[in-house]
Amino acid sequence: CKAMHVAQPAVVLASSRGIASFVCEYASPGKATEVRVTVLRQADSQVTEVCAATYMMGNELTFLDDSICTGTSSGNQVNLTIQGLRAMDTGLYICKVELMYPPPYYLGIGNGTQIYVIDPEPCPDSDF
């Protein structure tokens, strides 16, 4: 047995609409039936929670109703989408995966995905 490895892309550029998607993949040491995925944002030395979801293997991820995150799972991969991002949200987004059930518990923390967000330029006024 050893620590659970979590892999995620190093860099992602958000779309002009402020949407960023990335895959969080974990090497499951066992046959987990209940998994919890948390997205953390690190800025400077502060780490804050962006969103979290617990799901049963084979089922959809359920975030809180007003969460800025959505996601789908496929095997040991979780496809995460964060929306509503602005330039000030640029930072390192860390994927944390916990195998909650059955025991034993495993916790894996990725190295983070640097998400760059560029606010769109306002459209110039049209002169007719």
Partner: antibody, heavy 117, light 108 residues
Framework: EVQLVESGGGLVQPGGSLRLSCAAS????????MSWVRQAPGKGLELVAA????????YYPDTVKGRFTISRDNAKNSLYLQMNSLRAEDTAVYYC??????????WGQGTLVTVSS | ENVLTQSPATLSLSPGERATLSCSAS?????MHWYQQKPGQAPRLWIY???KLASGIPARFSGSGSRNDYTLTISSLEPEDFAVYYC???????????FGGGTKVEIK
């Protein structure tokens, strides 16, 4: 049954050093994050160090960073806390705690560290 | 740093009364854990994932809340419930958090 047994506490002078040990049994030690949590007399709980399962990553609050070092020996099912440059404010009961699915789910009985001249 | 503020610091109640303990987080978390500690003893996990009772915890205890505000409720206090209760985030990055300052439930 999960068991965590701390040892190594005692009286030490300011500026001195101490090494705490935690012997773990009853679970697969090398897959769990482990931590040290302290409690000063009459005060609340403070997380002072944590370490990932293979020992490659460690975490400290600013209050102890640079003075305390957490380590583990998975072959011996043991957790350690090396404390250097000790100060009076480090006086506390030090608990070894396992971080499991429901947070810190198992705790040792604690070992008292007293820093005084 | 996500600061947890527990209130009140002390709650003076009689056996049979209802106790409501609050924990407020400076930034949002999805789950909260609660620990009970009695004098001379190590803390013990009491409620996890906001509302789930740890093994052996009586049903008079309950937990609720979301995001920044969480509550531990004891419906009818028993003599053995008088202790200090601490909250700690059950999500986010656990090793960068501090415990709440604690609420002492004492006999009136």
């Amino acid at each position: 049954e999960v068991q965590l047994v701390e040892s190594g506490g005692g009286l030490v002078q300011p500026g001195g050093s101490l090494r705490l040990s935690c012997a773990a049994s009853g679970f697969t030690f090398n897959i769990y994050y482990m931590s040290w949590v302290r409690q000063a007399p009459g005060k609340g709980l403070e997380l002072v160090a944590a370490i990932n399962p293979d020992g490659g990553n460690t975490y400290y609050p600013d209050t102890v960073k640079g003075r305390f070092t957490i380590s583990r020996d998975n072959a011996k099912n043991s957790l350690y806390l090396q404390m250097n440059s000790l100060r009076a404010e480090d006086t506390a009961v030090y608990y070894c705690a396992r971080y499991g699915g429901p947070g810190f789910d198992s705790w040792g009985q604690g070992t008292l560290v007293t820093v005084s001249s | 740093e996500n600061v947890l503020t527990q209130s009140p610091a002390t709650l003076s109640l009689s056996p049979g009364e209802r106790a409501t303990l609050s924990c407020s987080a400076s930034s949002s978390v999805s789950y909260m854990h609660w620990y009970q500690q009695k004098p001379g003893q190590a803390p013990r996990l009491w409620i996890y994932d906001t509302s789930k009772l740890a093994s052996g915890i009586p049903a008079r205890f309950s937990g609720s809340g979301s995001r920044n505000d969480y509550t531990l409720t004891i419906s009818s206090l028993e003599p053995e419930d008088f202790a200090v209760y601490y909250c700690f985030p059950g999500s986010g990055f656990p090793f960068m958090y501090t415990f709440g300052g604690g609420t002492k439930v004492e006999i009136k």
